[in-house]
Interface confidence: low
């Protein structure tokens, strides 16, 4: 038998993916475990194999359909169970009534690009990926810029309190290499959390023109 404290956390990407992490103190590394998803209002169910991500935690992605298909709504409940094999039978290790739109974590923004760059400013745009149409404009963003000699953790956060898929970075240093990241969060959901950070976008400000103060 597998004993110890269990933690089972899942997030819905708002379209067709539920990502789960199960951690179990004292769990056996060679135990075969799965996540089973049984929606209360749908004619499908789904399973994914939990794969180890650390000594005592496993993760998997429930792929519910094509990436942009709207597989769940705000009134869906999905019963999620962690099932682990014990010899010839399966034992339920964890269960939760999962409310998808209370537990949202969107995909990281994509297609970051420099729209326009000058000596002291840079206009950057991005797109959200696989985000439900249900949100309409009810999204917010956080962005951060990596300056030379600093770490991402030291970068101040810029908050965009509306669905604005661009930003104009100001007061930059001329002829300097920067990196930029953005993440997104729906306003809906008690346990909703920020998406992962986007892939960093590297850009360089233009050099200052000689003899001019730009």
């Amino acid at each position: 038998a597998v004993n110890g404290t269990s933690r089972f956390t899942c997030f819905y990407n708002s379209r067709a993916n539920i990502s789960c992490v199960w951690s179990q103190d004292g769990a056996l590394q060679d135990t075969s475990c799965q996540v089973h998803a049984w929606p209360d209002r749908r004619r499908w169910n789904q399973t994914c194999e939990l794969l180890p991500v650390s000594q005592a935690s496993w993760a998997c992605n429930l792929i519910l359909g094509t990436p942009d298909s709207q597989k769940l709504t705000a009134v869906d409940i999905v019963t999620l169970r962690v099932m682990c094999r014990e010899g010839v039978r399966w034992r339920m290790m964890a269960i939760q009534d999962f409310k998808p739109f209370e537990n949202l974590r969107l995909m990281a923004p994509i297609s970051l690009q420099v729209v326009h760059v000058e000596t002291h400013r840079c206009n950057i745009s991005w797109k959200i990926s696989q985000a439900s149409h249900y949100f309409e404009r009810h999204l917010e963003f956080e962005a951060r810029t990596l300056s030379p000699g600093h770490t991402w953790e030291e970068a101040p956060l810029m908050t965009l309190k509306q669905k604005q898929e661009w930003i104009c970075l100001e007061t930059l240093t001329p002829d300097t290499q920067y990196e930029f990241q953005v993440r997104v969060k729906p306003l809906q959901g008690e346990f909703t959390t920020w998406s992962p950070w986007s892939q960093p976008l590297a850009f360089r400000t233009k050099p200052a023109a000689l003899g001019k103060d730009t």
Partner: antibody, heavy 119, light 106 residues
Framework: EVQLLESGGGLVQPGGSLRLSCAAS????????VHWIRQAPGKGLEWLGV???????DYNAAFISRLTISKDNSKNTVYFQMNSLRAEDTAVYYC?????????????WGQGTLVTVSS | DIQMTQSPSSLSASVGDRVTITCQAS?????MYWYQQRPGKAPRLLIY???NLASGVPSRFSGSGSGTSYTFTISSLQPEDIATYYC?????????FGQGTKVEIK
Amino acid sequence: EVQLLESGGGLVQPGGSLRLSCAASGFSVTSYGVHWIRQAPGKGLEWLGVIWSGGSTDYNAAFISRLTISKDNSKNTVYFQMNSLRAEDTAVYYCARAGDANYDGFAYWGQGTLVTVSS
Amino acid sequence: DIQMTQSPSSLSASVGDRVTITCQASSSVSFMYWYQQRPGKAPRLLIYDTSNLASGVPSRFSGSGSGTSYTFTISSLQPEDIATYYCQQWSTYPLTFGQGTKVEIK
């Protein structure tokens, strides 16, 4: 065969509390949500709330302050408790379950239990 | 809350007649359900997911619609169809029902 059997109805004083039971057979309440719906005499149907298979609940906001739905998995029974009853709570109270394709509407209903709120 | 408005509230038709009941939602819904309730009995599910016939329900019953407008039809009214019929939405909480349509035989 799926069956739902309500009990606990009867006469209740205004301001009093009501506790109903819904005994399920033919399925497990750890696998399906159980809903409560009521019908006042000569009136339509009103959804009150649900307890899901894992124990979480959703309530009609109009009743959230005085309604509690709970269950005992070992007895395969769901409980409905409403406080601060008034005359307009007089109704037949039903428990119901969705169909086998899960959420295919209320495919299974109890026979209902009549609650009369009167002094 | 989404209000469900059924019409007519009552109707009288002859055996063999085609009977149509409409249900108008105050905002768009994705799933519509129809129930039959005979006097003194619990409701019985007839139609789920707008147009699917529940198990054991005769094929003379049907449903259609989308958005805010839905229709329930009895293609050939039978004596045993005397009942009150309710629509119900299952798209947002609280789940809500129409006020009912009482069907009688002329």
